[in-house]
Structure formats: structure tokens, C-alpha cells
């Protein structure tokens, strides 16, 4: 009686229960009632990550350097190339086919964290005691100088954008 | 109904080659390999080789290998076998097979 | 190389009656998969080899069921259960789960 199901990591053909092609290479023919599956290895720029029947290895990805892209890891006859962005930029996509630059955050808004090759920057409003007037991809928001520590007292209040202005404390005679 | 049927006989000189073909017929050829086979006279069956036309994937036995190519020809259906530099000892009956069939046989005489 | 050993050479029979073949493999020739792919054939007089039975157990479509075959590892059997007088020829075994693939030297059935 001729199988209509078969068991994990084979495939059914022709009323027969093939084994199927183990990660890093591809069918070359199916199997027979005498012969098994014929497989073969990917070649050096190829890969297949599962289990399978293809006959033909899948591409290794290229990381671009023209859209900003470099290798972060290698791939194998089993696993795809991973690519990352430069220094400065960040992906596009989940699928990273591009890269662009890293956003910086406007005066009033701080570095919450910091861009990788796959995540853009992300910025927070400075809270009130807090202050940043660069426009940038790195700079947290910074503490309102403290005048008191200083002995001075405040002359201009701070903002989101600006320190304190600290001053002489006026001296009573 | 599947049939494999081989070229006729052959009578070749030591040192020449001999080229036997196969014609595939009643199922896809691309499916099967095909299995060579010879027998010398009065003796078994000694395998010589295989090849999987779909792909064109060879198995050659140690012993034919320096001397023996297996090749297709898928837009006829035709497999062949080819032995070069032949010696006396290679008289025998040439079988090509798909394993649940066989062909006739090709015999080839190697005499001087 | 993988050694087949068939005994007896030769078996005389006498119709009716059943018979037994062995074959010994010089080594276990379950494949890397679990699959044993040891095939009968037999070859009647002036005629090519016809399967008979494949993957030790399996009866060839058409091969009527006085035949069958069983073993494993390295001890294989053909039986056929009433022999007639049209079973006659030298019956050989065949492994093709390691290569190089290798037969038997043959059993010679014969009517007593």
C-alpha cells in the first residue's frame, strides 16, 4: 500500500517517501524504490537554511557598499550573509537591502538611544531641569547648571533648549 | 511499456573504444538512473556504473573508472557507455538497466 | 569493496519442492538513510536479467508470490516456496547501498 503521509524530513513522490535534502544542500534527484535521494553540497556563494527539495542553492545576499551596506557575518552553505550598515547610518528595513543616516536630535530634544547599523537614533523632549541646544546624534539632554552649588543665584531661567544664567547673589549691607 | 533497447554487437581491436548507446522508451528518462552491467562469457554480472540523466550524476565502480564514461543524450533518451583503451578481458555483454528493466545487451568482442 | 557470497553454486530442484538461496554481505549494508537496498534477480538462459525482488522483501510487480525474499545486515534469503520448471537460471544477488554496488557470484538453479 502506496504511503499518502510521510514521516518529518521527507518528502512524498511517485507513491514514495524521499528523504529530504539536509540544510547546506540541494536535490540532485529524488529518490526511487532503488536509489535514494541524490543530494549535493551549495556551491561557495550559496545556502539553503532547511530541510528541503530545491534544486537550486539560494544566493548569498550582497551587502552593497554603494548603499552603505558591509558584511556583519558571513554566510554558509547553511545560513544567509548578514549585512549592517556603515558607521553613521542605519537600515531602511527589517530586510536592510539599504542604508541612511543616522537622524540627529534638535535642540530641545536629547539622545534617549543610540543608533545601531539596524536603528535609527531616538530622541526625547528634555524634561523640565533638563536642556540640550545642539542638534545631535549622540548628546543626551543635559542637567540645568545647578547655581546654588555654585553660590550663585539663578538670573535667567532655563528652558528645553538653554541652561540657567546664574549670577551674584545680591549682598545686603 | 517501459523498454531500454541497446545497439547492436560490436567487434573492436585492443587499444580501441567501443561506444554502446541505450534508447529509453515508455516512461521519462529524467526520473531513473540508468545502471551498466557487463558480463564476461560464462561468468556473473560485474557493475560498472551509473548515471542519473536528470542530472547528469555519475557513479563509476574503482575498478572502469580511468576507463569508462557515462553520458546522455535527453532530447533522444538515449544513455551511453563508453570504454576506452579495450584489452581481450573486456569481451563480455554490455547491459544497460533502470534496475526493474533491462535491456538486450550489446556484446563486444575485443580480438586482435 | 563489499563482498556478496551466495551459496549453494548450484541447487538441483525438483518441481514442486521448495528452495532456499543465501547471500552474505562481507559487511552490513544498511545505508546511511536505514534503507537496504538488496535486489534478486534471476537470469534465464540466453536472456537478460529480470528483478525478482527489491529492498530485501519488496516482490517485483508481476514476479509471482512462490518468491520472497528476507534478512538483514548481512544475511539475506531467496525463497521460492513450489519451484516450477520455469524458474531455471542462475539467480544472483545485489546490493546497492554502498559503492562500489556489488552482485553475488550466482546461484545455478537447475531441475533434477
Known amino acids: 500500500e502506496p504511503p499518502t503521509a510521510c514521516r518529518e524530513k521527507q518528502y512524498l513522490i511517485n507513491s514514495q517517501c524521499c528523504s529530504l535534502c539536509q540544510p547546506g544542500q540541494k536535490l540532485v534527484s529524488d529518490c526511487t524504490e532503488f536509489t535514494e535521494t541524490e543530494c549535493l553540497p551549495c556551491s561557495e556563494s550559496e545556502f539553503l537554511d532547511t530541510w528541503n527539495r530545491e534544486t537550486r542553492c539560494h544566493q548569498h545576499k550582497y551587502c552593497d557598499p554603494n548603499l552603505g551596506l558591509r558584511v556583519q557575518q558571513k554566510g554558509t552553505s547553511e545560513t544567509d550573509t548578514i549585512c549592517t550598515c556603515e558607521e553613521g547610518l542605519h537600515c531602511m528595513s527589517e530586510s536592510c537591502e539599504s542604508c541612511v543616516p543616522h537622524r540627529s536630535c534638535l535642540p530641545g530634544f536629547g539622545v534617549k538611544q543610540i543608533a545601531t547599523g539596524v536603528s535609527d537614533t531616538i530622541c526625547e523632549p528634555c524634561p523640565v531641569g533638563f536642556f540640550s541646544n545642539v542638534s545631535s546624534a549622540f548628546e543626551k539632554c543635559r542637567p540645568w547648571t545647578s547655581c546654588e552649588t555654585k553660590d550663585l543665584v539663578v538670573q535667567q531661567a532655563g528652558t528645553n533648549k538653554t541652561d540657567v544664567v546664574c549670577g551674584p547673589q545680591d549682598r545686603q549691607r | 511499456q517501459v523498454q531500454l533497447v541497446q545497439s547492436g554487437a560490436e567487434v573492436k581491436k585492443p587499444g580501441a573504444s567501443v561506444k554502446v548507446s541505450c534508447k529509453a522508451s515508455?516512461?521519462?528518462?529524467?526520473?531513473?538512473?540508468i545502471t551498466w552491467v557487463r558480463q564476461a562469457p560464462g561468468q556473473g554480472l560485474e557493475w560498472m556504473g551509473d548515471i542519473h540523466p536528470g542530472s547528469g550524476s555519475t557513479k563509476y565502480n574503482e575498478k572502469f573508472k580511468s576507463r569508462v564514461t557515462l553520458t546522455v543524450d535527453t532530447s533522444i533518451s538515449t544513455a551511453y557507455m563508453e570504454l576506452s583503451r579495450l584489452r581481450s578481458e573486456d569481451t563480455a555483454v554490455y547491459y544497460c538497466?533502470?534496475?526493474?528493466?533491462w535491456g538486450q545487451g550489446t556484446t563486444v568482442t575485443v580480438s586482435s | 569493496d563489499i563482498v556478496m557470497t551466495q551459496s549453494p553454486l548450484s541447487l538441483p530442484v525438483t518441481p514442486g519442492e521448495p528452495a532456499s538461496i543465501s547471500c552474505r554481505s562481507s559487511q552490513n549494508i544498511v545505508n546511511s538513510q536505514g534503507n537496504t537496498y538488496l535486489e534478486w534477480y534471476l537470469q534465464k538462459p540466453g536472456q537478460s536479467p529480470q528483478l525478482l525482488i527489491y529492498k530485501v522483501t519488496n516482490r517485483f510487480s508481476g514476479v509471482p508470490d512462490r518468491f520472497s525474499g528476507s534478512g538483514s545486515g548481512t544475511d539475506f534469503t531467496l525463497k521460492i516456496s513450489r519451484v516450477e520448471a520455469e524458474d531455471v537460471g542462475v539467480y544472483y544477488c545485489?546490493?546497492?547501498?554502498?559503492?562500489?554496488?556489488?552482485f553475488g557470484g550466482g546461484t545455478k538453479v537447475e531441475i533434477k
Open positions: 545485489f546490493q546497492a547501498s554502498l559503492v562500489p554496488w556489488t
Open positions: 538497466a533502470r534496475r526493474d528493466y
Open positions: 515508455g516512461y521519462i528518462l529524467t526520473t531513473y538512473w
